[in-house]
Interface confidence: medium
Protein backbone atom coordinates (compact mmCIF):
# COMPACT_ATOMS: atom_id res chain seq x y z
CA UNK A 1 0.00 0.00 0.00
CA UNK A 2 1.29 3.51 -0.66
CA UNK A 3 0.43 6.50 0.96
CA UNK A 4 0.86 9.25 -2.01
CA UNK A 5 -2.47 10.23 -1.88
CA UNK A 6 -3.18 13.22 0.17
CA UNK A 7 -5.25 13.72 2.97
CA UNK A 8 -8.28 15.18 3.73
CA UNK A 9 -7.50 18.69 4.11
CA UNK A 10 -10.31 19.10 6.97
CA UNK A 11 -12.42 17.14 9.25
CA UNK A 12 -14.94 18.41 11.51
CA UNK A 13 -18.42 17.96 13.46
CA UNK A 14 -21.57 19.57 12.64
CA UNK A 15 -24.02 18.65 15.55
CA UNK A 16 -27.85 19.40 16.48
CA UNK A 17 -29.75 17.34 19.03
CA UNK A 18 -29.14 13.85 17.69
CA UNK A 19 -28.14 14.80 14.29
CA UNK A 20 -24.31 14.29 14.50
CA UNK A 21 -22.94 14.62 11.28
CA UNK A 22 -19.19 14.46 10.23
CA UNK A 23 -17.65 16.61 7.56
CA UNK A 24 -14.61 16.68 5.59
CA UNK A 25 -12.94 19.08 2.72
CA UNK A 26 -12.26 16.65 -0.65
CA UNK A 27 -8.77 15.47 -1.39
CA UNK A 28 -7.37 17.93 -4.56
CA UNK A 29 -7.74 16.20 -7.63
CA UNK A 30 -9.93 13.39 -6.73
CA UNK A 31 -10.58 10.95 -9.30
CA UNK A 32 -14.33 8.97 -9.83
CA UNK A 33 -13.17 6.31 -7.99
CA UNK A 34 -11.57 8.23 -5.00
CA UNK A 35 -13.72 7.18 -1.78
CA UNK A 36 -13.26 7.95 1.71
CA UNK A 37 -13.01 5.85 4.87
CA UNK A 38 -14.44 7.09 8.29
CA UNK A 39 -13.39 5.88 12.06
CA UNK A 40 -14.70 6.89 14.86
CA UNK A 41 -12.82 6.93 18.65
CA UNK A 42 -14.70 7.13 21.61
CA UNK A 43 -12.75 8.68 24.76
CA UNK A 44 -12.27 6.21 27.51
CA UNK A 45 -11.92 3.57 25.16
CA UNK A 46 -8.75 4.21 23.22
CA UNK A 47 -9.54 2.21 19.65
CA UNK A 48 -10.40 3.42 16.88
CA UNK A 49 -13.94 1.59 15.36
CA UNK A 50 -14.17 1.42 11.09
CA UNK A 51 -17.52 3.07 10.16
CA UNK A 52 -17.61 3.23 6.77
CA UNK A 53 -15.03 1.89 4.73
CA UNK A 54 -15.55 3.80 1.45
CA UNK A 55 -17.96 6.79 1.61
CA UNK A 56 -18.14 8.70 -1.81
CA UNK A 57 -20.16 11.61 -0.01
CA UNK A 58 -18.15 14.43 1.68
CA UNK A 59 -20.29 13.94 4.86
CA UNK A 60 -21.56 10.64 7.12
CA UNK A 61 -23.97 10.32 9.96
CA UNK A 62 -22.57 9.05 12.79
CA UNK A 63 -25.70 9.76 15.06
CA UNK A 64 -26.55 6.04 14.94
CA UNK A 65 -23.11 5.27 16.60
CA UNK A 66 -23.00 8.29 18.43
CA UNK A 67 -25.91 8.01 20.35
CA UNK A 68 -24.65 7.93 23.78
CA UNK A 69 -22.54 11.56 23.64
CA UNK A 70 -24.63 13.40 25.99
CA UNK A 71 -24.09 10.65 28.47
CA UNK A 72 -20.28 10.41 27.42
CA UNK A 73 -16.65 12.18 27.47
CA UNK A 74 -17.10 12.31 23.95
CA UNK A 75 -15.38 11.24 20.61
CA UNK A 76 -12.76 12.38 17.95
CA UNK A 77 -13.07 10.71 14.37
CA UNK A 78 -11.11 10.42 11.45
CA UNK A 79 -10.76 9.98 7.61
CA UNK A 80 -8.78 9.22 5.11
CA UNK A 81 -9.06 9.34 1.29
CA UNK A 82 -9.02 5.72 -0.73
CA UNK A 83 -8.34 5.11 -4.21
CA UNK A 84 -7.90 1.23 -4.85
CA UNK A 85 -5.02 -0.20 -3.52
CA UNK A 86 -4.09 3.45 -2.60
CA UNK A 87 -4.64 5.32 0.58
CA UNK A 88 -3.58 8.83 2.56
CA UNK A 89 -2.69 9.11 5.67
CA UNK A 90 -5.40 9.93 8.46
CA UNK A 91 -7.11 13.61 9.12
CA UNK A 92 -8.26 13.34 12.56
CA UNK A 93 -10.97 16.18 14.02
CA UNK A 94 -9.03 18.89 15.64
CA UNK A 95 -11.48 19.20 18.78
CA UNK A 96 -12.93 16.55 21.07
CA UNK A 97 -16.67 16.18 19.67
CA UNK A 98 -18.89 16.20 22.96
CA UNK A 99 -22.42 17.72 24.15
CA UNK A 100 -20.61 21.37 24.13
CA UNK A 101 -20.07 20.69 20.52
CA UNK A 102 -24.22 20.30 19.95
CA UNK A 103 -25.75 23.17 18.07
CA UNK A 104 -28.54 23.44 19.90
CA UNK A 105 -32.16 24.81 18.02
CA UNK A 106 -36.10 24.55 19.00
CA UNK A 107 -38.40 21.91 17.22
CA UNK A 108 -40.92 24.76 16.08
CA UNK A 109 -42.80 27.78 17.04
CA UNK A 110 -46.03 28.04 17.59
CA UNK A 111 -48.53 31.52 17.85
CA UNK A 112 -51.80 31.47 18.89
CA UNK A 113 -54.16 34.05 19.88
CA UNK A 114 -56.16 34.61 22.85
CA UNK A 115 -58.37 37.35 23.39
CA UNK A 116 -55.73 39.51 22.07
CA UNK A 117 -52.68 37.81 23.71
CA UNK A 118 -50.50 35.94 21.60
CA UNK A 119 -49.52 33.10 22.97
CA UNK A 120 -46.16 31.54 22.08
CA UNK A 121 -45.21 27.91 22.73
CA UNK A 122 -41.66 26.85 22.08
CA UNK A 123 -41.96 22.80 21.17
CA UNK A 124 -38.30 21.08 21.58
CA UNK A 125 -36.75 19.27 19.56
CA UNK A 126 -37.79 15.50 19.27
CA UNK A 127 -35.85 13.42 16.76
CA UNK A 128 -36.57 10.08 15.73
CA UNK A 129 -33.29 8.86 16.75
CA UNK A 130 -33.09 9.54 20.39
CA UNK A 131 -33.86 6.90 22.73
CA UNK A 132 -36.84 7.04 25.05
CA UNK A 133 -35.59 8.72 28.09
CA UNK A 134 -33.27 11.34 26.08
CA UNK A 135 -35.22 14.23 25.95
CA UNK A 136 -33.66 17.95 25.16
CA UNK A 137 -35.33 18.94 28.65
CA UNK A 138 -33.90 15.71 30.78
CA UNK A 139 -30.46 16.60 29.12
CA UNK A 140 -30.19 20.23 29.62
CA UNK A 141 -32.32 19.95 32.75
CA UNK A 142 -31.78 23.17 33.96
CA UNK A 143 -31.17 26.92 33.08
CA UNK A 144 -33.05 26.55 29.54
CA UNK A 145 -33.19 29.74 28.32
CA UNK A 146 -34.69 31.31 24.57
CA UNK A 147 -33.66 34.72 23.16
CA UNK A 148 -36.84 36.03 21.51
CA UNK A 149 -36.96 38.17 18.31
CA UNK A 150 -40.33 40.10 17.88
CA UNK A 151 -40.90 42.17 14.35
CA UNK A 152 -43.62 43.88 13.71
CA UNK A 153 -45.29 44.18 10.71
CA UNK A 154 -47.01 47.28 9.68
CA UNK A 155 -44.25 48.62 11.04
CA UNK A 156 -40.55 49.95 11.05
CA UNK A 157 -39.04 46.43 11.00
CA UNK A 158 -36.93 46.99 14.15
CA UNK A 159 -37.09 43.54 16.41
CA UNK A 160 -37.63 43.58 19.80
CA UNK A 161 -35.00 40.76 21.44
CA UNK A 162 -35.47 39.91 24.65
CA UNK A 163 -34.91 36.70 26.71
CA UNK A 164 -37.19 33.75 28.61
CA UNK A 165 -36.75 30.79 30.72
CA UNK A 166 -39.84 28.94 30.01
CA UNK A 167 -41.18 27.55 26.66
CA UNK A 168 -44.67 29.28 27.04
CA UNK A 169 -44.56 33.03 26.23
CA UNK A 170 -46.75 35.64 25.73
CA UNK A 171 -46.84 38.92 23.99
CA UNK A 172 -48.74 42.01 24.80
CA UNK A 173 -49.63 43.82 21.45
CA UNK A 174 -51.59 46.95 23.37
CA UNK A 175 -54.22 46.68 20.77
CA UNK A 176 -52.48 46.56 17.58
CA UNK A 177 -53.04 44.71 14.67
CA UNK A 178 -51.26 43.60 12.28
CA UNK A 179 -48.70 40.76 11.65
CA UNK A 180 -46.23 39.56 14.80
CA UNK A 181 -43.31 37.91 13.98
CA UNK A 182 -41.41 35.78 16.05
CA UNK A 183 -37.93 33.66 16.16
CA UNK A 184 -36.89 32.15 18.65
CA UNK A 185 -33.10 31.23 19.29
CA UNK A 186 -32.18 28.51 22.40
CA UNK A 187 -29.50 28.44 24.64
CA UNK A 188 -28.08 27.06 27.74
CA UNK A 189 -26.77 29.78 30.71
CA UNK A 190 -24.55 27.33 32.12
CA UNK A 191 -23.61 25.98 28.83
CA UNK A 192 -21.31 27.38 26.09
CA UNK A 193 -23.34 25.74 23.49
CA UNK A 194 -24.12 27.87 20.26
CA UNK A 195 -27.89 28.05 19.16
CA UNK A 196 -29.75 28.51 15.97
CA UNK A 197 -32.44 30.91 14.96
CA UNK A 198 -35.65 29.37 14.90
CA UNK A 199 -37.90 29.56 10.96
CA UNK A 200 -39.70 32.76 11.84
CA UNK A 201 -43.38 32.29 12.84
CA UNK A 202 -45.92 35.20 11.82
CA UNK A 203 -49.72 35.55 13.30
CA UNK A 204 -51.98 38.33 12.25
CA UNK A 205 -54.02 40.36 14.71
CA UNK A 206 -57.05 42.07 13.21
CA UNK A 207 -59.58 44.65 15.51
CA UNK A 208 -62.34 41.22 16.05
CA UNK A 209 -59.22 39.72 19.06
CA UNK A 210 -59.62 42.94 20.60
CA UNK A 211 -63.58 42.55 21.77
CA UNK A 212 -63.80 39.74 23.56
CA UNK A 213 -64.45 39.99 27.37
CA UNK A 214 -63.63 37.31 29.97
CA UNK B 1 -47.63 59.11 36.23
CA UNK B 2 -49.42 56.65 37.96
CA UNK B 3 -49.08 55.47 41.40
CA UNK B 4 -49.49 51.67 42.58
CA UNK B 5 -50.81 50.70 45.73
CA UNK B 6 -50.97 47.23 47.03
CA UNK B 7 -52.61 45.68 50.25
CA UNK B 8 -53.69 41.98 51.02
CA UNK B 9 -50.70 40.47 51.43
CA UNK B 10 -49.83 38.36 54.63
CA UNK B 11 -49.26 34.54 56.02
CA UNK B 12 -51.35 31.85 55.36
CA UNK B 13 -51.21 27.70 55.57
CA UNK B 14 -50.86 25.85 52.02
CA UNK B 15 -53.81 25.54 50.21
CA UNK B 16 -55.57 28.61 51.53
CA UNK B 17 -56.53 31.35 49.76
CA UNK B 18 -55.76 35.48 49.69
CA UNK B 19 -56.61 38.33 47.73
CA UNK B 20 -54.13 41.14 46.53
CA UNK B 21 -55.44 44.50 45.84
CA UNK B 22 -53.65 46.90 43.44
CA UNK B 23 -55.26 50.67 43.79
CA UNK B 24 -54.20 52.75 41.04
CA UNK B 25 -54.36 56.34 41.12
CA UNK B 26 -55.33 57.13 38.12
CA UNK B 27 -58.25 55.88 35.64
CA UNK B 28 -57.73 51.97 34.11
CA UNK B 29 -58.65 53.21 30.95
CA UNK B 30 -55.18 55.53 30.69
CA UNK B 31 -53.61 51.86 31.26
CA UNK B 32 -53.10 49.14 28.35
CA UNK B 33 -52.07 46.39 30.59
CA UNK B 34 -52.14 46.17 34.33
CA UNK B 35 -50.15 42.79 35.58
CA UNK B 36 -48.53 40.97 38.77
CA UNK B 37 -45.62 40.00 39.61
CA UNK B 38 -43.62 38.00 42.15
CA UNK B 39 -40.09 37.85 43.04
CA UNK B 40 -38.45 35.37 46.11
CA UNK B 41 -34.59 35.87 47.26
CA UNK B 42 -32.11 35.69 44.80
CA UNK B 43 -34.53 35.10 41.91
CA UNK B 44 -35.72 37.27 39.27
CA UNK B 45 -39.02 38.75 39.61
CA UNK B 46 -41.56 36.86 37.13
CA UNK B 47 -44.63 37.63 35.85
CA UNK B 48 -48.01 35.84 37.40
CA UNK B 49 -50.99 37.72 35.80
CA UNK B 50 -52.03 40.53 33.22
CA UNK B 51 -55.13 42.22 32.03
CA UNK B 52 -55.58 43.91 29.29
CA UNK B 53 -57.81 46.86 30.78
CA UNK B 54 -59.68 47.61 27.48
CA UNK B 55 -61.16 44.60 27.27
CA UNK B 56 -60.40 42.36 30.42
CA UNK B 57 -58.68 39.68 28.90
CA UNK B 58 -55.93 37.91 30.56
CA UNK B 59 -53.30 35.91 30.46
CA UNK B 60 -51.54 33.27 33.21
CA UNK B 61 -48.60 31.40 33.28
CA UNK B 62 -48.65 27.87 33.42
CA UNK B 63 -47.59 27.78 37.12
CA UNK B 64 -50.45 29.39 38.12
CA UNK B 65 -52.71 28.99 35.85
CA UNK B 66 -56.62 26.95 37.10
CA UNK B 67 -55.53 28.64 41.37
CA UNK B 68 -54.50 32.69 40.18
CA UNK B 69 -57.39 35.15 38.94
CA UNK B 70 -56.46 38.36 37.80
CA UNK B 71 -59.46 40.76 38.35
CA UNK B 72 -60.35 44.62 37.52
CA UNK B 73 -62.71 47.41 39.07
CA UNK B 74 -62.63 50.58 36.59
CA UNK B 75 -64.79 52.42 38.62
CA UNK B 76 -63.00 52.13 42.23
CA UNK B 77 -59.51 51.95 40.05
CA UNK B 78 -58.36 48.76 41.41
CA UNK B 79 -56.81 45.60 40.23
CA UNK B 80 -57.45 42.37 42.23
CA UNK B 81 -55.15 39.28 42.57
CA UNK B 82 -57.58 36.16 44.05
CA UNK B 83 -55.18 33.64 45.03
CA UNK B 84 -56.27 29.94 45.72
CA UNK B 85 -54.71 26.25 46.77
CA UNK B 86 -51.59 28.31 47.50
CA UNK B 87 -48.53 26.21 48.23
CA UNK B 88 -45.33 26.96 50.04
CA UNK B 89 -43.51 28.32 46.07
CA UNK B 90 -45.41 30.62 45.85
CA UNK B 91 -44.48 32.18 48.85
CA UNK B 92 -42.63 35.97 47.72
CA UNK B 93 -43.00 39.55 47.33
CA UNK B 94 -46.03 40.53 44.61
CA UNK B 95 -45.98 43.60 42.72
CA UNK B 96 -48.18 45.23 41.19
CA UNK B 97 -47.49 46.93 37.63
CA UNK B 98 -48.55 48.95 35.06
CA UNK B 99 -48.09 49.66 31.58
CA UNK B 100 -49.39 52.58 29.03
CA UNK B 101 -48.89 51.19 25.77
CA UNK B 102 -45.69 48.68 25.46
CA UNK B 103 -43.72 48.25 22.34
CA UNK B 104 -41.38 45.58 23.85
CA UNK B 105 -44.38 42.93 23.74
CA UNK B 106 -43.03 40.48 25.71
CA UNK B 107 -45.24 39.80 28.88
CA UNK B 108 -42.03 40.57 31.22
CA UNK B 109 -40.97 43.02 33.85
CA UNK B 110 -38.98 45.16 31.10
CA UNK B 111 -42.14 45.67 29.37
CA UNK B 112 -44.24 47.36 32.37
CA UNK B 113 -43.64 51.07 33.46
CA UNK B 114 -45.06 51.38 36.49
CA UNK B 115 -44.43 49.36 39.85
CA UNK B 116 -45.88 49.66 42.96
CA UNK B 117 -43.95 49.10 46.34
CA UNK B 118 -44.97 45.30 47.19
CA UNK B 119 -46.75 42.87 49.10
CA UNK B 120 -45.31 40.13 50.77
CA UNK B 121 -47.22 36.58 50.71
CA UNK B 122 -45.90 33.99 53.07
CA UNK B 123 -46.87 30.38 52.52
CA UNK B 124 -46.15 27.92 55.29
CA UNK B 125 -46.85 24.04 54.70
Known amino acids: HGTELPSPPSVWFEAEFFHHILHWTPIPNQSESTCYEVALLRYGIESWNSISNCSQTLSYDLTAVTLDLYHSNGYRARVRAVDGSRHSNWTVTNTRFSVDEVTLTVGSVNLEIHNGFILGKIQLPRPKMAPANDTYESIFSHFREYEIAIRKVPGNFTFTHKKVKHENFSLLTSGEVGEFCVQVKPSVASRSNKGMWSKEECISLTRQYFTVTN | QVQLQESGGGSIQAGGSLRLSCAAS????????MAWFRQSPGKEREPVAV????????FYPDSVKGRFTISQDNAKMTVYLQMNSLKSEDTAMYYC??????????????????WGQGTQVTVSS
Open chain 2, 97 to 114: AAVRKTDSYLFDAQSFTY
Open chain 2, 26 to 33: RYLYSIDY
Open chain 2, 51 to 58: IYTASGAT
